[in-house]
């Protein structure tokens, strides 16, 4: 059978949700010693780095300038050392947001619930679409979707102290196309234990897989990295 | 403070129709769902509906979804209830109130309608 | 539509004393259950919120008890300005009802 290296990991860097005409970066973190990356967009070929030097850095960024609904889809990369090539990483949505209209969200019953209580988000964009995406800050990974014509609810049932947080919701054109961002609208949801008090709301982290941990080589990491080639070697 | 400020009374003939305002006040009026009420001495209250000014979403009891139209003009910050064929079993006062925190926690002093020929 | 009855329209108290308004929904509504105050010529006041929660500013001698379908409002040593309309109501699900109304009566 045919040997292939592992998988590289392919990053959006700080969003994958990039408003139209900014500049995207996507990482792709492969082995130190990779000679080539190469990103492919829809299947095709879309950019090829080299890094330099290729045995001191263990993967490459890719700028994607002008951010349209074009050059919005499924990207996935792939690395070589040597002659040999890599398997496919997974794939990576790139969103292009701003397009067209602004849709407005809001939550019901109120944005101070209690613990238990049945919430549902309304999200509402005059404009043809028939998708509508919610997401909670810090975790734009986590997207719900729902259909309707001019609205879509989002019902989150009977919600917890883990609903807290902001919220935003955009109109979708198409998968990879999306509206301005509506404003925030922040949920605030008290404990069965407390009383009037508000508790605070939980802090949100940007998305931890929304950076690129490309890094530079050491001596003890050139040892590790050639020791692990080795052992693959040794098991295969 | 927060303030729902409703005209007193309204008298109108049977048949007609009549638009009940509340200015509101004291908070965002985007942000909080208006709430329409009935209140008809002997009758106990009756939920009308609701709507959302930010993007004038809105729930109503199906018993009043034929009898009652709600709006809002975010511009002046007042929310309206439309009333339209009215009969003798519409005179009753009519409260806007607002839920900022939990349950209905700020009401209107209500508007009485009397349907009279 | 979920019913909320208050059996007792009227309650008879002396001040001092301790008195309990009970509302009954027809079917479950968790706890998702308000309390509210109308004394004449006013609009109504919510006290009580999710059963129990007391609103600030409402004092202590009102608390809110109960679960599922049946619930109580209950006021401890009754003062004079606790002469009201007293009233339910269920928002766990559409359309919102209200109880009928228990007034208290002041001896």
């Known amino acids: 059978p045919k040997q292939t290296l592992p998988k590289p990991i392919i990053r959006a860097e700080s969003t994958y949700m990039v408003p139209k005409e900014k500049q995207a970066t996507l990482c792709c973190q492969g082995s130190y010693g990779a000679v080539e990356y190469q990103l492919h967009f829809e299947g095709s070929l879309f950019a090829v780095e080299r890094p330099k030097p290729p045995e001191r850095i263990n993967g490459v960024k890719f700028h994607i300038p002008d951010m349209n609904s074009r050059k919005a889809g499924r990207y996935s990369c792939i690395y070589r050392v040597g002659e040999l090539w890599s398997e496919r990483s997974d794939l990576l949505d790139l969103v292009v947001t701003e397009m067209y209209d602004t849709p407005t969200l809001s939550v019901h019953p109120g944005p101070e619930v209690t613990s238990g209580e049945k919430v549902t988000f309304y999200c509402r964009l005059d404009t043809a679409t028939s998708m509508f995406l919610l997401l909670k800050e810090g975790r734009s990974r986590d997207v719900q979707r729902s259909y309707g014509k001019v609205q879509a609810e989002f019902p989150m049932g009977p919600v917890t102290t883990a609903h807290r947080g902001s919220y935003r919701c955009f109109g979708s054109y198409n998968n990879y196309a999306w509206s301005f961002p509506s404003e925030p609208v922040k949920l605030l949801v008290t404990g069965d234990i407390e009383n009037t008090s508000l508790a605070p709301t939980d802090p949100t982290f940007p998305d931890s897989w929304d950076t690129c941990l490309l890094t530079r080589e050491t001596g003890l990491q050139k040892d590790l990295a050639l020791w692990d080639h080795t052992a693959q070697n040794l098991l295969r | 403070q927060v303030q729902l400020q409703q005209p007193g009374a309204e008298l109108v003939k049977p048949g007609a129709s009549v638009k009940l305002s509340c200015k509101a006040s004291?908070?965002?009026?985007?942000s909080y769902w208006m709430h329409w009420v009935k209140l008809r001495p002997g009758q106990g209250f009756e939920w009308?509906?609701?709507?959302?000014?930010?993007?004038?979403?809105?729930n109503y009891n199906e018993k009043f979804k034929r009898k009652a139209t709600l709006t809002v003009d975010k511009s002046s910050s007042t929310a309206y209830m439309q009333l339209s064929s009215l009969t003798s079993e519409d005179s009753a006062v009519y409260y806007c109130?607002?839920?900022?925190?939990?349950?209905?926690?700020?009401w209107g002093q209500g508007t009485s309608v009397t349907v009279s020929a | 539509d979920i019913v909320m009855t208050q059996s007792q329209k009227f309650m008879s108290t002396s001040v001092g004393d301790r008195v309990s308004v009970t509302c009954k929904a027809s079917?479950?509504?968790?706890?998702?259950v308000a309390w509210y105050q109308q004394k004449p010529g006013q609009s109504p006041k919510a006290l009580i919120y999710?059963?129990?929660f007391r609103y600030s500013g409402v004092p202590d001698r009102f608390t809110g008890s109960g679960s599922g379908t049946d619930f109580t409002l209950t006021i401890s040593n009754v003062q004079s300005e606790d002469l009201a309309e007293y009233f339910c109501?269920?928002?766990?699900?559409?359309?919102?009802?209200f109880g009928s109304g228990t007034k208290l009566e002041i001896k």
């Open positions: 109501q269920q928002y766990n699900s559409y359309p919102f009802t």
């Open positions: 009308i509906g609701e709507i959302i000014p930010s993007n004038g979403v809105t």
């Open positions: 999710s059963t129990s």
């Open positions: 109130t607002i839920r900022l925190r939990y349950a209905l926690d700020y």
């Open positions: 079917q479950n509504v968790g706890t998702n």
């Open positions: 004291g908070y965002t009026f985007t």
